[in-house]
Amino acid sequence: RPSRVYKPEGNTKRALTLKDILNGTFSYKTYFPNWISEQEYLHQSEDDNIVFYNIETRESYIILSNSTMKSVNATDYGLSPDRQFVYLESDYSKLWRYSYTATYYIYDLQNGEFVRGYELPRPIQYLCWSPVGSKLAYVYQNNIYLKQRPGDPPFQITYTGRENRIFNGIPDWVYEEEMLATKYALWWSPDGKFLAYVEFNDSDIPIIAYSYYGDGQYPRTINIPYPKAGAKNPVVRVFIVDTTYPHHVGPMEVPVPEMIASSDYYFSWLTWVSSERVCLQWLKRVQNVSVLSICDFREDWHAWECPKNQEHVEESRTGWAGGFFVSTPAFSQDATSYYKIFSDKDGYKHIHYIKDTVENAIQITSGKWEAIYIFRVTQDSLFYSSNEFEGYPGRRNIYRISIGNSPPSKKCVTCHLRKERCQYYTASFSYKAKYYALVCYGPGLPISTLHDGRTDQEIQVLEENKELENSLRNIQLPKVEIKKLKDGGLTFWYKMILPPQFDRSKKYPLLIQVYGGPCSQSVKSVFAVNWITYLASKEGIVIALVDGRGTAFQGDKFLHAVYRKLGVYEVEDQLTAVRKFIEMGFIDEERIAIWGWSYGGYVSSLALASGTGLFKCGIAVAPVSSWEYYASIYSERFMGLPTKDDNLEHYKNSTVMARAEYFRNVDYLLIHGTADDNVHFQNSAQIAKALVNAQVDFQAMWYSDQNHGISSGRSQNHLYTHMTHFLKQCFSLSD
């Protein structure tokens, strides 16, 4: 029988250590220009100077010195469009995933001094410049304020704001996390005349309360209006204010389409089309119907009108509308027609051109792959990303469609640039795409480059991670493979991380890392040096990541397979993959583990409790344990409602607690932060209770006052050290 013992052979290169990972020794840099015109951008230098660059004249100079930044401890900045002022952001204080509060100072570039008089209040929840000039909109204590100039007194636009009750211009918890994915809910019109904002009324939403222990004698209680599946949701209204005369007409309410307003609904996004045209997207609570509504400002009425013939309905018959979110429209120059990604008749998400009705939409891209994001639409070009190239779903390339041509011609801008090094790109375009930056995330070392938007010619390398390249020269990195396996008509892509001196004739322990959530993707051609890289490099563990059913960018049949039955196929497909890996001959069947975080913690828990005997041990970090405990928008998107006449039965069947007995024959490590605002500690508390009630032995670790990311330096070090010990013990690896 082949030896089970793996020992790295003599080599001048050293293996990665856990310390390397925890210290972030091998982290990479990216370079995103902060575009301020067609050919100019700003960038914060390593030493914190704010530098201005003109691509065409090749001039560069410091517009704001690091000493000015340092004088207020600023960590971020924002230049006003008239280039007269800069806001400086300091005292960053994180709230949820995207939201934070900060102190803002306004610096007058003309006079070289901070604006005095009518200083901004603190802490501010959100602040932004108008797209033209130097008007400021900001949110303070859940209300929106407007300054016509930085030195002017503010006009208070809203007065209804109330902590944990009514939010103006910023989302509540559930909208921030599950719908908007932003810290803001206000949008300036392109000319800065109008300001659109959302009011979220959380007055009737149940509160999640948890203790924050801090250092005091008594813990603090954190209260968050958090609608769990089936609970009362936020009530949303959209308003638009004329910022020239905000005190005349007051906020103008934008009407909700009738077919949406007839039952519970969500606001999903707002896009300004022109100075007097706005596009709102709405979604029914049962998230298979989305309505895009184009509204116009009627000067004669002084109101926003949303005609029925400017409502476009998007519906899914096989699952939910959109991917993770419903896509947003990219309007063309005529301010009437737009490009949008949605499922074609074969169930693949593709770009469509809508001129009048969705029924008459012209399909722009097609094939058994998916268009992922539309970056920019100009007079003659449309730039988008997709995973078409060479049929790898986990790649991202940037394409240009010349829409001026008839028929439109397609060109892959990135496919052949640095083919081995770069297969996963994103891009950042100047206003009308005269220039753009490409940021490549791997599989080789990330690199950021600047390009001419007409010719696609590379102009300069912005960041190539030379230092990282040098420091990795003496490191034994594992080998990464991305391949696919087939099972009964299904294809599963997987990423395998193999120890440095991998030998197929030997047997290795296997660790499955899983996420597996709907519309997620784990098998991506990106560079990473992280915990699992270390486990392969130093501990000789084979790591595998598998994208099972429910994951994204492989068509709706694959994606919607999990609709209304979470926790079934995601688990089944991980088990299938493990069996296939065993068949490959180099996996030690007695040393297989699985771990995951969040949705991955849910899947790993269910996999461990599958009763298959495949896994010796596993770890669940911050797992969901029941979809009834999770946020309404997310749970219901994929599971429907937890009511008898809808899908309560599967809500109950798909809990981790229901499988408590099946944990008896595995080593289970359950980990959760006590201040998790997202997947509440309640989830793990209920798993632990069920395991105790079933008299099942297990290990657990909580992280006091840590949120869903368990990201404080000390906690993170402890977490990964603890998981490493657990895994090495499980795999009988010496310390």
């Epitope: 005349h248 906020p251 309410e253 002084h302």
Partner: antibody, heavy 117, light 108 residues
Framework: EVQLLESGGGLVQPGGSLRLSCAAS????????MSWVRQAPGKGLEWVSA????????YYADSVKGRFTISRDNSKNTLYLQMNSLRAEDTAVYYC??????????WGQGTLVTVSS | EIVLTQSPGTLSLSPGERATLSCRAS???????LAWYQQKPGQAPRLLIN???RRATGIPDRFSGSGSGTDFTLTISRLEPEDFAVYYC?????????FGQGTKVEIK
Amino acid sequence: EVQLLESGGGLVQPGGSLRLSCAASGFTFSSYAMSWVRQAPGKGLEWVSAIIGSGGITYYADSVKGRFTISRDNSKNTLYLQMNSLRAEDTAVYYCAKGWFGGFNYWGQGTLVTVSS
Amino acid sequence: EIVLTQSPGTLSLSPGERATLSCRASQSVTSSYLAWYQQKPGQAPRLLINVGSRRATGIPDRFSGSGSGTDFTLTISRLEPEDFAVYYCQQGIMLPPTFGQGTKVEIK
């Protein structure tokens, strides 16, 4: 031509109620914020309440909060002010005006409310 | 709330003369949010000056508004007989909107 016509004023006892109406014409009523402004005999102007075009947001002066309710019926182009628990100091000419916090560019002729026993 | 103080309380002038009315705010308002109204006995107020010291529709150009921050002025370049009335300034930057106590322009 824009016209605002108030009605419903009169004599009422302290603690009593009154409902003022303002019939609007000559503009798209539902699109505009409307306010009530009052003027006590021989005194200056005092803003009382405002409501946005859709009726979805309302504001009140502290002196009337909890006693007065502003509302509108856009199908009837009419603005209302329901006044409860009236006091002697509420005696005034009540004007309806087109506008939110300012820029009151059109005013009605006013209706007199007298609170007296 | 923002307190607006108008001065003088009464201004006695003859037709053809220049009238200068003052309005001082307890905190900065800016001209964007300050308006002037005219009211004649037994009539409703009438908007004269609006956002950014602009004249309202139909207001003769002898009326002009100026000022910024906390100090504002309404100027009537040549008084006409129909201009004798009470004038009010009003701020709309902050809730509640407030009016000055008024300046009465009377015939001397």
